[in-house]
Every structure is written in structure tokens, then in C-alpha cells.
């Protein structure tokens, strides 16, 4: 299991249920790099933190998955959590 994957999971598990729901909704509309597709809405909304981490890594790989997760956290006003996630992935 990679460091970035662990860091993503750690961040998502630290969200409240309401925040995790908001994270998924923002993830649906976040601007993506060219060549990447959005995770399908139907699959996304029912996922827990563990499933969502797996899906983020399978869709975007670890490095970009962590960056994308950090950006969505920033969009939610969770800059500190985003910084911790990025620091953990760059250790």
C-alpha cells in the first residue's frame, strides 16, 4: 500500500459524514487534468472513505489522486488538512 494512498485515506477518514458527502459532490465537478475522467456519480455517492480512496487511486493513480483530494479539501475550506495530505505524500 503506497504512502499517498494512506494519506488520502487518513484525510477522508477525518471528515465528518456531512463533509464526506460534500467532498463527493465537489469531486463530481472539480476541474480535472486533460486525459482524466470523472468517477461516475452513481458509484461515488454510496462509497465510504475506504472505497472512495480505492476509487480515487484506481481512477487517478496515487500522485494525482492525492493532489486532486487536496484540491477538493481546499475547495471545502480544509486547507490545513490539504497541506497535511500533501506533506505526507512528499515525505
Amino acid at each position: 500500500m503506497g504512502r499517498a494512498r494512506d494519506a488520502i485515506l487518513d484525510a477522508l477518514e477525518n471528515l465528518t459524514a456531512e463533509e464526506l458527502k460534500k467532498f463527493k459532490l465537489k469531486l463530481l465537478s472539480v476541474p480535472l487534468r486533460e486525459g482524466y475522467a470523472a468517477i461516475p456519480r452513481g458509484a461515488l455517492l454510496s462509497m465510504d472513505a475506504l472505497d472512495l480512496t480505492d476509487k480515487l487511486v484506481s481512477f487517478y493513480l496515487e500522485t494525482y489522486g492525492a493532489e486532486l483530494t487536496a484540491n477538493v479539501l481546499r475547495d471545502m475550506g480544509l486547507q490545513e488538512m490539504a497541506g497535511q495530505l500533501q506533506a505526507a505524500t512528499h515525505q
Partner: antibody, heavy 114, light 107 residues
Framework: QVQLQQPGTELVKPGASVKLSCRAS?????????????LEWIGNINLSNGRTNYN??FRAMATLTVDKSSSTAYTQLSSLTSEDSAVYYC?????????????WGQGTSVTVSS | NIVMTQYPKSMSLSIGERVTLRCKAS??????VSWYQQKPEQSPKLLIY???NRYTGVPDRFTGSGSATDFILTITSVQAEDLADYHC?????????FGAGTKLELK
Amino acid sequence: QVQLQQPGTELVKPGASVKLSCRASGWTHWVKQRPGQGLEWIGNINLSNGRTNYNEKFRAMATLTVDKSSSTAYTQLSSLTSEDSAVYYCANSMVPHFFPMDYWGQGTSVTVSS
Amino acid sequence: NIVMTQYPKSMSLSIGERVTLRCKASENVGSYVSWYQQKPEQSPKLLIYGASNRYTGVPDRFTGSGSATDFILTITSVQAEDLADYHCGQSYNYPLTFGAGTKLELK
């Protein structure tokens, strides 16, 4: 158009405290602007869960709270000096991405004077 | 803390001129930069967010560009109502920080 409601003026004595209010929603920021100066971010509070973030520069003098029942955010500013005479704005972040401050109150002008 | 440096501090210009305002971040802030317009005795108003996204109702003569550390606000043909202070701000990291502002004045 969201309207953030703030009282217009407050006159307080040096060393005293003042509690500013703002009818708002979501993330509410507090921003200080001294006459002829730039903008300084004091901190923010999430009205739905009470999560706060502070600028360390203001942590000792500003306390951010929320009354969910009235959707009102407050900042209590304590031990005020003349340096704290400024306009204090509240602002919301409602745009889904990049966390800008898209709605601003009209500001409360605080004058610290004996 | 991330320092946002704006330049020039002020600009004197004529109506119809093209204006370029610059903002430099002390470290990489991705695209997490916004531009605000503030007229005398008024609250700031959001113009641009995410470095290049025009906010609802903002005229298309305002354009934002840049990423990482260097950002630009361009006004293609300045109008009388554009004479104001312009602030850039970053929302990449706490504390959120703003530049000192650029004042646009009439020549």
C-alpha cells in the same frame, strides 16, 4: 443575491471588547481593513459545524463563534487599541471551487477612542 | 505565511486603455488566487477566482491568468467605473492572505 447583514458602526474604549455580528451561511470569513490599507484575514468559521481557522496574528484578540439557530456568525474582539480602529467585513465562500470570498457584508466600522 | 505582492501600487490611465495588474505569490499557490475590486467606501467585490474564472456578472473586459506564483488581471479597455482598488488574494493555505492592492486612477 445573498445579502450579508452587518451593523454599521461601533465606538469602543481602549482595552474594551466588541462583538460583531453577521447574518450569513456556509464558511464565513472576517477581514480587517484599516483606513487606506489593504485587507487582512482574521479567520473563518463554518456555520454548519463550527469548525474555525485563525490567522495567528489575531488569535489572541479575536474569537469566532456561531449561532446556528439564527445563521449568525460573530467575532469578539478584545483588549482593543487604536490600531484596531478599522472596518471589519464578513464574507462568505459559496462558489463550489477555489474558495474565494464571493459575498461581502457592507462592513462594520469600529472606532477605538477614549 | 504566503506573501502576495502586487504591482504597480498605483496606475494613472486614460479611459479605453488596456491595463495589466500583477500579483506574485511567495510560494506555489496553484490556481487558488482571486481578484477583488473595491471602490471608495464600498466592500470588495469578487471579479476572478481560480486565477482565471470570471465571477457571475463580471464584464468580459476583465480577464485573469497565471498559475503557481505569477498572476495577472487584465482589463482590455478600462471604463470610468473600473477606477478602484484591486486586491489579489490566495486561498491555497491558511492564513488566507491578500496583496496590498493596486489603485487605478484617471490620468
